[in-house]
C-alpha cells in the first residue's frame, strides 16, 4: 500500500545512503505483497509452497540483533540476485496462465534490478566487497505444468516477500547503530 | 474473522518475569509480523518490538533490549511475550498487534493485557 | 529517536462539528512519496484501532468521515463531521525509522 517511491537522492552520507536503500526495499516489498494477493485471488493456493532453487530465508540464520552491515548487504544481494532470476525465468517459462500478470511482473523485476543497483552503490561506498554467491547457480528448467508454473510463482513471491521484510527491519536496525 | 486472543491478567511481584500470550486467527499467521505495545497509565504508547513468525530473530526497541523476549509457536499461530526483572513502571496494559511487513502500522490488536507489579 | 507532538492535548466540539488534530514530529518522516504516519483511535478499555495508514490512506472499515494529510514533520487527521462514536482519543505514531513512535494523544471529548 501507498504511493510509488520517486527518486532516492544520491548522496555521501552512509545513513541517507542506507535510507534510499531502505525506501526502495518497503517499496518493492509493497508492489511483491500488491502481486502475491492478485496471484492467491487468481490462483489460490493450498498452504505453503517451496522450490528448491530458492535462497534459505536469511531470517533462519540468526537474529537480527546480532547482524553486522556488511553481512546483511552482501547477503541481501546475493538473494536478491537470485530472486531476480527467478523472476526472469517466471516470465519466460511462466506459459499462458502467467502471462495474464506479465506487466506486473515486468515493473517487479525493474524495481528489483533498481534495487539491487542501489545495493550495488551502497556496497561500493562503504567500500565492501562484491560478493559471488557462496552457491552454485542451480539451473532453472521449465515448468513440469500450468499448475508447476504456479506454484512456483508463489513461491517466488512468498519468499521475496519475507526477504525484503528480513532486509528492510535488518537495513533500519542497523541504520540506528551508525 | 481475524482476531488476536491476549491471555489474561498478571499480578507479579518486583524482580518476577511474566509471559504474555497472543494467539492469532483469520488469517496467515506468517503474513505479518506480530508487534507488542506497552500503555502505562498516563503515559504514550510505547513500542516493544516484533517479530516475523516465519523464523529468525526478534527486533526490539533498545529501552526493552535485554528485558523483552519475543517468541513464536508457528503450529499453534501464537506469538509471545516475556518481560523479566519486573518493576513498578512495567505497570501497563500490553498489547500484541497485527504488523503490516516493512511498514509498522498495526491494523489488528488483541484485547490488551493488564500486568500489575507490586509488591 | 523521532517526538511526535499532538496538538491540542483535549478538544471539545459538539456532533455535527469539523474537527482538525494536529501531529508534528521532530524531524520528517516522509521520503520521496511516502509518509510513514499512521494514526489510531482509542476508547476507555478498548485496544487502539487504525484509521489512517502511511498518512493519507483509509483503512479498511473505517467511515469516509476520516481523512489524513500532510507531509515531512506536520500531519492532520481531520473529521468532518462528528458522530457520538468519534469521541475518544486520537494517537499518531511514525515508522519512519525504528523505533516507531507514538503522540502523547489527543482527546477528543463532546462539548
Known amino acids: 500500500p501507498g504511493p510509488p517511491a520517486g527518486s532516492p537522492r544520491v548522496s555521501s552520507d552512509p545513513r541517507a545512503d542506507l535510507d534510499s536503500a531502505v525506501l526502495l526495499t518497503r517499496s518493492l516489498l509493497a508492489d511483491t505483497r500488491q502481486l502475491a494477493a492478485q496471484m492467491r485471488d487468481k490462483f489460490p493456493a493450498d498452504g505453503d509452497h517451496s522450490l528448491d532453487s530458492l535462497p534459505t530465508l536469511a531470517m533462519s540464520a540468526g537474529t537480527l540483533g546480532s547482524l553486522q552491515l556488511p553481512g546483511v548487504l552482501t547477503r541481501l544481494r546475493v538473494d536478491l540476485m537470485s530472486y531476480l532470476r527467478h523472476v526472469q525465468w517466471l516470465r519466460r517459462a511462466g506459459g499462458p496462465s502467467l502471462k495474464t500478470l506479465e506487466p506486473e511482473l515486468g515493473a517487479l523485476q525493474a524495481r528489483l534490478e533498481r534495487l539491487l543497483r542501489r545495493l550495488q552503490l551502497l556496497m561500493s561506498r562503504l567500500a565492501l566487497p562484491q560478493a559471488a554467491p557462496d552457491q552454485p547457480v542451480i539451473p532453472l528448467g521449465p515448468p513440469a505444468s500450468a499448475w508447476g508454473s504456479i506454484r512456483a510463482a508463489h513461491a517466488i513471491l512468498g519468499g521475496l516477500h519475507l526477504t525484503l521484510d528480513w532486509a528492510v527491519r535488518g537495513l533500519l536496525l542497523l541504520k540506528t547503530r551508525l | 474473522e481475524v482476531q488476536l486472543v491476549q491471555s489474561g491478567a498478571e499480578v507479579k511481584k518486583p524482580g518476577a518475569s511474566v509471559k504474555i500470550s497472543c494467539k492469532a486467527s483469520g488469517y496467515t499467521f506468517t503474513d505479518y509480523n506480530m508487534d507488542w505495545v506497552k500503555q502505562a497509565p498516563g503515559q504514550r504508547l510505547e513500542w516493544i518490538g516484533d517479530i516475523n513468525p516465519h523464523g529468525g530473530g526478534p527486533i526490539y526497541n533498545q529501552k526493552f533490549t535485554g528485558r523483552a523476549t519475543l517468541t513464536v509457536d508457528k503450529s499453534a499461530s501464537t506469538a509471545y511475550m516475556e518481560l523479566s526483572s519486573l518493576r513498578s513502571e512495567d505497570t501497563a496494559v500490553y498489547y500484541c498487534a497485527r504488523g503490516e511487513l516493512g511498514h509498522w502500522y498495526f491494523d489488528v490488536w488483541g484485547q490488551g493485557t493488564t500486568v500489575t507489579v507490586s509488591s | 529517536d523521532i517526538v511526535l507532538t499532538q496538538s491540542p492535548a483535549s478538544l471539545a466540539l459538539s456532533p455535527g462539528e469539523r474537527a482538525t488534530l494536529s501531529c508534528r514530529a521532530s524531524?520528517?518522516?516522509?521520503?520521496?512519496?511516502?509518509?510513514?504516519i499512521h494514526w489510531y483511535q482509542q476508547k476507555p478499555g478498548q485496544a487502539p484501532r487504525l484509521l489512517i495508514y502511511l498518512a493519507s490512506n483509509l483503512e479498511s472499515g473505517v467511515p469516509a468521515r476520516f481523512s489524513g494529510s500532510g507531509s515531512g514533520t506536520d500531519f492532520t487527521l481531520t473529521i468532518s463531521s462528528l458522530e457520538e462514536e468519534d469521541f475518544a482519543t486520537y494517537y499518531c505514531q511514525h515508522s519512519r525509522d525504528l523505533p516507531p513512535t507514538f503522540g502523547q494523544g489527543t482527546k477528543l471529548e463532546i462539548k
Open positions: 524531524k520528517s518522516v516522509s521520503t520521496s512519496g511516502y509518509s510513514y
